[in-house]
């Protein structure tokens, strides 16, 4: 132990410690609960949750979605391909979660918690996928201009964007949860 430091070990008790899979599962459910809290405010504030004009706004967004080729569905399940897709998708969602940060009045803290807990989830998954090189990180410049574009939208589109981000993120996490439980 270096000088000026003191080290104390913590030993595990007889109870089973959390495994990587259990902790990732809990982290996703934590984020999903956070999304539910944010959606509650969004739906109370506007009628976006019942709107039929979603397709209009959805064209402007390139939100990550699970597809057959990603190997995350039961038919054609592929652990490696799927894990890459989950991590890549979460990294792509980060810019949208950044956009959400100024979109909530009474749930500002929850929006921050969703953003931070997603960063933690990415770290947990990257540890699990340490041998995978196929993970591409989004370009910061592209993200910055996307953020500017989203923030420049009119109020109605901003409300719709917020609603769509939360809904898509929820669907993506639910698909990820199902897939990870098969790994």
């Amino acid at each position: 132990v270096p000088p000026g430091e003191d080290s104390k070990d913590v030993a595990a008790p007889h109870r089973q410690p959390l495994t990587s899979s259990e902790r990732i599962d809990k982290q996703i459910r934590y984020i999903l609960d956070g999304i539910s809290a944010l959606r509650k405010e969004t739906c109370n504030k506007s009628n976006m949750c019942e709107s039929s004009k979603e397709a209009l706004a959805e064209n402007n967004l390139n939100l990550p979605k699970m597809a057959e080729k990603d190997g995350c569905f039961q038919s054609g399940f592929n652990e490696e391909t799927c894990l890459v897709k989950i991590i890549t998708g979460l990294l792509e969602f980060e810019v949208y979660l950044e956009y959400l940060q100024n979109r909530f009045e009474s749930s500002e803290e929850q929006a921050r918690a969703v953003q931070m807990s997603t960063k933690v989830l990415i770290q947990f998954l990257q540890k699990k996928a340490k041998n995978l090189d196929a993970i591409t990180t989004p370009d910061p410049t592209t993200n910055a201009s996307l953020l500017t574009k989203l923030q420049a939208q009119n109020q109605w589109l901003q409300d719709m964007t917020t609603h769509l981000i939360l809904r898509s993120f929820k669907e993506f996490l639910q698909s990820s949860l199902r897939a990870l439980r098969q790994m």
Partner: nanobody, 124 residues
Framework: GGGLVQPGGSLRLSCAAS????????IGWFRQAPGKEREGVSC????????YYADSVKGRFTISRDSAKNTVYLQMNSLKPEDTGVYYC????????????????????????RGQGTQVTVSS
């Protein structure tokens, strides 16, 4: 055990875990001064990395983690004689429910694992 430090000095406590991954747990640092009740000094959530500091240590103490070393730290600066006591770290699942209250981390009943403690004495 810990160490004897002069007032105004610094000390870094480290807490390494064996048999489980510290990253998966909320972390707490506690201390017990002679003849006083155990006090929660600082905590860090594993879910969203939120931190908590007792008023008495705010601005002087910093909690951190090192995933690669499976270790957590408490950096203590500008130490005062009233910081004297036995310090120990703990790990628990108090932070796994969305909307948890960070201040609950100071309850030692919230923890599954606990270090054996180290004596810190601040005196000239």
């Amino acid at each position: 055990g810990g160490g004897l430090v002069q007032p105004g000095g610094s000390l870094r406590l480290s807490c390494a875990a064996s048999g489980f991954t510290l990253d998966y747990y909320g972390i707490g640092w506690f201390r017990q001064a002679p003849g006083k009740e155990r006090e929660g000094v600082s905590c860090m959530s594993s879910s969203d990395l939120k931190t908590y500091y007792a008023d008495s240590v705010k601005g002087r103490f910093t909690i951190s983690r090192d995933s690669a070393k499976n270790t957590v730290y408490l950096q203590m600066n500008s130490l005062k004689p009233e910081d004297t006591g036995v310090y120990y770290c703990a790990a628990g699942t108090w932070d796994l429910k969305f909307g948890y209250n960070i201040t609950t981390c100071v309850r030692s009943s919230e923890y599954d694992y606990r270090g054996q403690g180290t004596q810190v004495t601040v005196s000239s």
